[in-house]
């Protein structure tokens, strides 16, 4: 489990405490409070400060990562005096026992795999557990299907992503009978971790002078518009010399995805395949199946 807290302020002051399950920081209420403020400072020199009303004695953090260690701070002014207290949140447990190389990816629009490796100093009996919370509703999802390596959980498969939002909090806790295991946590944007399927319904129609390629944008987990897609077409002339470069064409997403290019008859046999990416991320999908068009005698016009 995540660590207990050490306080670096007079113990008599505010009695600040943090609940990592709810991300709630609380302190003893003071009479006649005129001002209160809570925030944390992380290792990236950023300050995270939730909204707080003067009469509240707690605050909830929405989007924070804790595994590198953070410092919480509470400032309270009353009509008589001012209080300040800091709270260090260390990642207790033996160094190097936390899950490492953590990554997740969404695929096929509604499936997700997360994988990690056991920490280099973790004991043989270590067991890891993944919890996911979305950043808005704070609903917790426990891993339903673990991927195992010699009995140790080293991954997770989810086939229901309905609880996720555009940014989600991932926590990998560890347990062992021998020693304390450090935790790993991460905030991941679905935008960064979704891997698109290749475009579907790729067709090629040719007339005497041109060929028109059409395709459909892939179904995605995120709600995206056509403007969010970038495509690459690989138009390849068959039976060319080894080392001949393929023609790679970049096409921006459109309401109707199409690419028209000059190709006069008789045309040699060609193939075309397409891949897709989020225009702001450029994590390319795999290529669609190659569609052939043209022929040695130039008679073939329409291909699915």
């Amino acid at each position: 489990e995540k660590s207990d807290l050490r306080t670096v302020a007079p113990a008599s002051s505010l009695n600040v405490r943090f609940d990592s399950r709810t991300m709630n920081l609380s302190w003893d209420c003071q009479e006649n409070t005129t001002f209160s403020k809570c925030f944390l400072t992380d290792k990236k020199n950023r300050v995270v400060e939730p909204r707080l009303s003067n009469n509240e004695c707690s605050c909830t953090f929405r989007e924070i990562c804790l595994h590198e260690g953070v410092t919480f701070e509470v400032h309270v002014n009353t009509s008589q005096r001012g209080f300040q207290q800091k709270l260090l949140y260390p990642n207790s447990g033996r160094e190097g026992t936390a899950a490492q190389n953590f990554s997740c990816f969404i695929y096929n629009a509604d499936l997700m795999n997360c994988t990690w490796a056991r920490g280099p100093t973790a004991p043989r009996d270590v067991q890891y557990f993944l919890y996911i919370r979305n950043s808005k509703r704070r609903r917790e999802i426990r891993c339903p299907y673990y991927i195992q390596d010699s009995g140790t959980h080293v991954g997770c498969h989810l086939d229901n992503l309905s609880g996720l939002t555009s940014r989600n909090y991932f926590l990998v806790n560890g347990t062992s009978r021998e020693i304390g295991i450090q935790f790993f946590d991460s905030l991941l944007d679905t935008k960064k971790i979704e891997r698109f399927n290749p475009p579907s319904n790729v067709t090629v129609r040719c007339n005497t002078t041109h060929c028109l390629v059409r395709w459909k944008q892939p179904r995605t987990y995120q709600k995206l518009s056509y403007l969010d897609f970038q495509y690459q077409l690989d138009v390849h002339r068959k039976n060319t010399q080894p080392g001949t470069e393929n023609l790679l064409i970049n096409v921006s997403g459109d309401l109707e995805n199409r690419y028209n290019f000059p190709s006069s008859e008789p045309r040699a046999k060609h193939s075309v395949k397409i891949r897709a990416a989020d225009v702001r991320i450029l994590n390319w999908s795999s290529w669609s199946e190659a569609i052939e068009f043209g022929s040695d005698d130039g008679h073939h016009h329409h291909h699915h």
Epitope: K44, N45, R46, V47, V48, E49, P50, R51, F61, R62, E63, K136, S166, R167, D189, K191, Q230, N250, A277, D278, V279, R280, I281, L282, N283
Partner: antibody, heavy 123, light 107 residues
Framework: QMQLVQSGAEVKKPGASVKVSCKVS????????MHWVRQAPGKGLEWMGG????????IYAQKFQGRVTMTGDTSTDTAYLELSSLRSEDTALYYC????????????????WGQGTLVTVSS | EIVMTQSPATLSLSPGERATLSCRAS??????LAWYQQKPGQAPRLLIY???SRATGIPDRFSGSGSGTDFTLTISRLEPEDFAVYYC?????????FGQGTKLEIK
């Protein structure tokens, strides 16, 4: 099309506070994360922080800790940046900025910018 | 935090010429890179995101390339209105940091 319109230039004395506004049109403030970027005269761009009007949480650079407050009024779709204990090195153009895809700690590119508010700190 | 370094600091060219601006990240930022153009007295304008995708309304003489740590903004044929300051920005890791800028001036 979204537009961000900022308040006018301000001249302040060292130690004073300034509050800059950024009015959103073509969108509602609750749909956005609003960011503030500043630019000292003749210098580059510096991200100050971002604010989520929906949950009220702010993420900002530690160098501004204790001096910066980012807020929003969802009834008027206006975001605010307040900077206190002003010093001469705070003299800069202050921009509000947002994008099509944002979180409070940044955007996947800032698509939309206010026109900037010049804050001059001088005794 | 990730440090973005742009070069050259100033680039002097004539209209019609080709401009090549460089941006280097202190660690890999994948393709999470944007380019902005800023003219005197104006706010920055987004030109490129995803290292190579042009933002809406940006002429095709502007192109971006690169991934990982090394990125390039190319203006194939300079128009008089292209003379400005250009900034790169990474959005891989918060805080999202800007380069110090390259001033493109008329020779």
């Amino acid at each position: 099309q979204m537009q961000l319109v900022q308040s006018g230039a301000e001249v302040k004395k060292p130690g004073a506070s300034v509050k800059v506004s950024c009015k959103v049109s073509g969108h509602t403030l609750t749909e956005l994360s609003m960011h503030w970027v500043r630019q000292a005269p003749g210098k580059g761009l510096e991200w100050m922080g971002g604010f989520d009007p929906e949950d009220g949480e702010t993420i900002y650079a530690q160098k501004f800790q204790g001096r910066v407050t980012m807020t929003g009024d969802t009834s008027t779709d206006t975001a605010y940046l307040e900077l206190s204990s002003l010093r001469s090195e705070d003299t800069a153009l202050y921009y509000c900025a947002t994008g099509r895809y944002c979180h409070k700690d940044g955007c996947y590119g800032f698509d939309y910018w206010g026109q900037g508010t010049l804050v001059t700190v001088s005794s | 935090e990730i440090v973005m370094t742009q070069s050259p600091a100033t680039l002097s060219l004539s209209p019609g010429e080709r401009a090549t601006l460089s941006c280097r990240a202190s660690q890999s930022v994948s393709s999470y890179l944007a380019w902005y153009q800023q003219k005197p007295g104006q706010a920055p304008r987004l030109l490129i995101y995803g290292a190579s995708s042009r933002a809406t309304g940006i002429p095709d003489r502007f192109s971006g390339s690169g991934s990982g740590t090394d990125f390039t903004l190319t203006i194939s044929r300079l128009e008089p209105e292209d003379f400005a300051v250009y900034y790169c920005q990474q959005y891989d890791s918060s805080p999202h940091t800007f380069g110090q800028g390259t001033k493109l001036e008329i020779k």
